[in-house]
Amino acid sequence: AVNGTSQFTCFYNSRANISCVWSQDGALQDTSCQVHAWPDRRRWNQTCELLPVSQASWACNLILGAPDSQKLTTVDIVTLRVLCREGVRWRVMAIQDFKPFENLRLMAPISLQVVHVETHRCNISWEISQASHYFERHLEFEARTLSPGHTWEEAPLLTLKQKQEWICLETLTPDTQYEFQVRVKPLQGEFTTWSPWSQPLAFRTKPAALGKDT
């Protein structure tokens, strides 16, 4: 038997993946545990094996189909259970009725690239990955730029309140190395959260022309 506080959190990537994290204080060490997904209106069930990510938390991805397939809709409810093996039996450790479009976390934006760079500005574009067509244009983005001598945490957040997959960074210093990241969030969903940050894109502004400021 396990005592202690249990927390079971899952997010839907809007297409074919539900990622779950289960935390348990009275940690189970060598027990095999699974997340089991049981949709209310679909003919499939899905399990994934929870793997340890820290001393008292486990994670897994319920892969519901091909990455860009639309496996769930706004009306679906999926019963999610954590089941752990106790001898030959399985014990339910946590359970939730999961509304996928109330618990969204998209994949990090991909394909970041510098479109145009000058001495003081840089135009950057990106793409969203595995995002449902249901959102249409109802997405927002946050971006941040890492300047020399600073940390990501110190970088000011730039907010794009619409589906705009590019940004023009201004007032940059000439001949300087920067890094850029972006993340995305649907406007839909009570418990929806930001995607992970994209992989950083490194770029360098052009040097100022001698005797002239561009």
């Epitope: 089991h36 499939w44 069930n45 399990t47 094996e49 793997l51 897994c60 189909g65 990455p67």
Partner: nanobody, 123 residues
Framework: EVQLVESGGGLVQAGGSLRLSCAAS????????MAWFRQAPGKEREFVAS????????DYGDSVKGRFTVSRDNAKNTVYLQMNNLKPEDTAVYYC????????????????WGQGTQVTVSS
């Protein structure tokens, strides 16, 4: 839906070894818990072994514990069954099975099946 093709069967003497392979195609392999079953002439299909999506947890039928090892390579979309110390009673057609639900993998009617590969153990 996933399609499964078994290979590696054959004739082997008692005490020998064989390695069966099951190649999967047509769907995302890591969605599936994979299993091996076998069916001897005139007998019902019998659970042999299973392996979870990550490959971390395995399960075995009582008759093969300690002799057979199931594993998977998610990069190659393949599941394996290493069979050591084979006995004449291991003679059967060996089937690969797939199910998205770990808790249904022993259920004969819920699985997707391969065509099977014959294993014959002579004494």
């Amino acid at each position: 839906e996933v399609q499964l093709v078994e290979s590696g069967g054959g004739l082997v003497q008692a005490g020998g070894s064989l390695r069966l392979s099951c190649a999967a195609s047509g769907d995302v392999f890591v969605r599936y818990t994979m299993a091996w079953f076998r069916q001897a002439p005139g007998k019902e299909r019998e659970f042999v072994a299973s392996v979870t999506d990550s490959g971390r947890t395995t399960d075995y039928g009582d008759s093969v514990k300690g002799r057979f090892t199931v594993s998977r390579d998610n990069a190659k979309n393949t599941v394996y069954l290493q069979m050591n110390n084979l006995k004449p009673e291991d003679t059967a057609v060996y089937y690969c099975a797939a199910n998205t639900d770990y808790f249904q993998i022993r259920s004969l009617d819920a699985n997707t099946w391969g065509q099977g590969t014959q294993v014959t153990v002579s004494s």
